[in-house]
């Protein structure tokens, strides 16, 4: 994709003055460079692409091309007065002289170093001028990591060991990830340091401190973020079987979210040693806080549920180390922490959290008062949503999406199943018309239930005080108009009588005379067409 700089095309639809201003500000010459940074490996050559569109009749004698460091304006390379002025940058730059006449102003940078990283400006001047900046991103791949262990002998389960992962001569700084044999990320107790050498290349050393299990694989991944290159190494530690060997019990780190009424699986696993048989296994699930027994497997058999007969193990998977518990028809009261306790030769335990949730119903909206509403009235809008868990977050907003926070009262009541009914009351003064929306959010499910009401007040209604003022003024105005009409009528009548009296004194065709109130006959003249004289 090309990034265009100094394009005059934007002025086309603008007035002449704006066009001239645009021309002055950006120059008329269009210089094109890549939008994305140019990625170059240390020690290789890189081409910083730059091009312009030569006009007909263009000759190199007219061309002035200057490459410089964008920030410092330090000269890198130039072409002026019809000839290549050479490199001003450690003699490691070159143009493409054969291609200049076609508008190719690209710069070749040889034996790239870390210090070259940055922005380079390509400045082209012919009759007009233009410039654009291209970024050079330097990169160097990291070596395959080497792994060291401290201590590295007489290791027993339960020992704390320090695993060091070292990778060399990379650029830019690496991202380091540790994971166990199952691919689970290990983030705690990791210390990573990166040191740049005199060439600016980084050596990365990442240290992981772990407590050994029965045995384990630890992998280190060094990622070059620019090259998206991953360098891997791993170490497998098999400690001596020893008194310090706890059973490593694994459960999910995040709470298990279960909908009310559905079944939930509380995952728990352990690593069976070679020769393990179910006769050796003792598995006990209990409530973490009260230690109340939930389910157990001892003496080689499932001892069943001690928790309202709603729990079950996965018997076919136990021998593979799957100690998960199935909890049926989840209730709000089930929420909390469950401990998975596994005892074989040694023992271990881990707690898993169960987070219960129930979606809220679509809110129903009620209005009080709900008739004869007029702008200026205060109304109470109630938004009700039912049978959700945990407690909801309620948000009000107007038709424009503006939050309404004042005069909101929200109450949440739990029913006998522990599910919440939420009632949120908004008091507002009505405008001419308005939409009011209520959003009920379940914070665990990230589920939003919306309800809205649009209130359209009676169009020509006013508050009572304004009504009486309006009525009074209207009556006065009508009375005034009636009086005015009466006076006019009297005046006209009087002048008619006087005119009639005058006409009787003259000789004439009585019938042919016209009163001032009668219209004249239309003449044939077009100009007079449509005229009315009163």
């Amino acid at each position: 994709m090309l990034r265009r700089r100094g394009s005059p095309g934007m002025g086309v639809h603008v007035g002449a003055a704006l066009g001239a201003l645009w021309f002055c500000l950006t120059g008329a010459l269009e210089v094109q460079v890549p939008e994305d940074p140019v990625v170059a490996l240390v020690g290789t050559d890189a081409t910083l692409c730059c091009s312009f569109s030569p006009e007909p009749g263009f000759s190199l004698a007219q061309l002035n091309l200057i490459w410089q460091l964008t920030d410092t304006k330090q000269l890198v390379h130039s072409f002026a007065e019809g000839q290549d002025q050479g490199s001003a940058y450690a003699n490691r730059t070159a143009l493409f002289p054969d291609l200049l006449a076609q508008g190719n102003a690209s710069l070749r940078l040889q034996r790239v170093r870390v210090a070259d990283e940055g922005s380079f400006t390509c400045f082209v001047s012919i009759r007009d001028f233009g410039s654009a900046a291209v970024s050079l991103q330097v990169a160097a791949p990291y070596s395959k990591p080497s792994m060291t262990l401290e201590p590295n002998k007489d290791l027993r389960p339960g020992d704390t060991v320090t695993i060091t992962c070292s990778s060399y001569q990379g650029y830019p700084e690496a991202e380091v990830f540790w994971q166990d044999g199952q691919g689970v990320p290990l983030t705690g107790n990791v210390t990573t340091s990166q040191m740049a050498n005199e060439q600016g290349l980084f050596d990365v050393h990442s240290i992981l401190r772990v407590v050994l299990g029965a045995n384990g694989t630890y992998s280190c991944l060094v990622r070059n973020p620019v090259l998206q290159q991953d360098a891997h190494s791993s170490v497998t530690i098999t400690p001596q079987r020893s008194p310090t060997g706890a059973v490593e019990v694994q459960v999910p780190e995040d709470p298990v979210v279960a909908l009310v009424g559905t079944d939930a699986t509380l995952r728990c696993s352990f690593s069976p040693e070679p020769g393990f048989s179910l006769a050796q296994l003792n598995l006990i699930w209990q409530l973490t806080d009260t230690k109340q027994l939930v389910h157990s497997f001892t003496e080689g058999r499932d001892q069943g549920s001690a928790y309202a007969n709603r729990t079950a193990l996965f018997p076919d998977l136990l021998a593979q180390g799957n100690a998960s518990l199935r909890l049926q028809r989840v209730r709000v009261a089930d929420e909390g922490s469950f401990t998975c306790f596994v005892s074989i030769r040694d023992f271990g335990s881990a707690a898993v959290s169960l987070q219960v949730a129930a979606p809220y119903s679509k809110p129903s909206m009620t209005l009080e008062p709900n008739k004869d509403l007029r702008p200026g009235d205060t109304v109470t809008i109630t938004c009700s949503s039912y049978r959700g868990y945990p407690e909801a977050e309620v948000f009000w907003q107007d038709g424009q999406g503006v939050p309404l926070t004042g005069n909101v009262t929200t109450s949440q009541m739990a029913n006998e199943q522990g599910l919440f009914d939420v009632h949120s009351v908004l008091r507002v003064v009505l405008g001419a018309n308005g939409t009011y929306s209520c959003l009920v959010r379940n914070p665990v499910l990230q589920q939003d239930a919306h309800g809205s009401v649009t209130i359209t007040g009676q169009p020509m209604t006013f508050p009572p005080e304004a009504l009486w003022v309006t009525v009074g003024l209207s009556v006065c105005l009508i009375a005034l108009l009636v009086a005015l009409a009466f006076v006019c009528w009297r005046k006209i009548k009087q002048s008619c009588e006087e005119e009639n009296a005058g006409a009787e004194d003259q000789d004439g065709e009585g019938e042919g005379s016209k009163t001032a109130l009668q219209p004249l006959k239309h003449s044939d003249s077009k100009e007079d067409d449509g005229q009315e004289i009163a």
């Epitope: 339960g158 079987r241 008194p243 310090t244 060997g245 706890a246 059973v247 006769a279 050796q280 003792n282 006990i284 209990q286 230690k291 001892t298 003496e299 401990t339 306790f341 005892s343 030769r345 040694d346 023992f347 271990g348 335990s349």
Partner: antibody
Framework: EVQLVQSGAEVKKPGSSVKVSCKAS????????ISWVRQAPGQGLEWMGG????????NYAQKFQGRVTITADESTSTAYMELSSLRSEDTAVYYC????????????WGQGTLVTVSA | EIVLTQSPATLSLSPGERATLSCRAS??????LAWYQQKPGQAPRLLIY???NRATGIPARFSGSGSGTDFTLTISSLEPEDFAVYYC???????????FGQGTKLEIK
């Protein structure tokens, strides 16, 4: 460093009760199996019972069932052993002991508490 | 309840000699058997666990063997500091309950 520090010596009357404490340091108290072992003068070791705090339920040797109560307070990392209906033959050194995390083996011992039952 | 019987009750040997201590269970104890050493005025010390594994810091002259109901602790060449009382101990699978043998006193001849 693992340490189990027990309460001091006690002299008790027959028929009374004694409660010995054992405060643990150096590790996650909840994840260890704590045992109580006693040794009468010139006699062998006798396991009385034990508890895994994270599990919560104590187990007792048949001989002491009904007379001994073992508890653990996770908040203070302290285990307790209470022996009731004391008789003269309960005169002994009472040890609390534990293994490594997740191990049933007993390889760390308290200094012992001498309980003397005498009229 | 499992009973552990140790023999002999007392064993008199000289430094440099080989000591063999026996522990018999009234019923099979799998391999959950341990050996402890106790010196006068001290708490016991774990020597062997799971019948044959040497605990941390225990010299190689101590070894354990056996399975099921018969177990043996062997000290290949006695050192002066090895003279003490030795106890075997078993653990039941579930619930975890322990039994100690009555002990074998190893004394200098």
């Amino acid at each position: 460093e693992v340490q189990l520090v027990q309460s001091g010596a006690e002299v008790k009357k027959p028929g009374s009760s004694v409660k010995v404490s054992c405060k643990a340091s150096g590790g996650t108290f909840s994840s260890y199996a704590i045992s109580w072992v006693r040794q009468a003068p010139g006699q062998g070791l006798e396991w009385m019972g034990g508890i895994i705090p994270i599990f919560g339920t104590a187990n007792y040797a048949q001989k002491f069932q009904g007379r001994v109560t073992i508890t653990a307070d996770e908040s203070t990392s302290t285990a307790y052993m209470e022996l009731s209906s004391l008789r003269s033959e309960d005169t002994a050194v009472y040890y609390c002991a534990r293994g490594e995390r997740g191990s049933y083996l007993i390889d760390y011992w308290g200094q012992g508490t001498l309980v003397t039952v005498s009229a | 309840e499992i009973v552990l019987t140790q023999s002999p009750a007392t064993l008199s040997l000289s430094p440099g000699e080989r000591a063999t201590l026996s522990c018999r269970a009234s019923q099979s104890v799998s391999s959950y058997l341990a050996w402890y050493q106790q010196k006068p005025g001290q708490a016991p010390r774990l020597l062997i666990y799971d019948a044959s594994n040497r605990a941390t810091g225990i010299p190689a002259r101590f070894s354990g063997s056996g399975s099921g109901t018969d177990f043996t602790l062997t000290i290949s060449s006695l050192e002066p500091e090895d003279f003490a009382v030795y106890y075997c101990q078993q653990r039941s699978n579930w619930p975890p309950m322990y039994t100690f043998g009555q002990g074998t006193k190893l004394e200098i001849k």
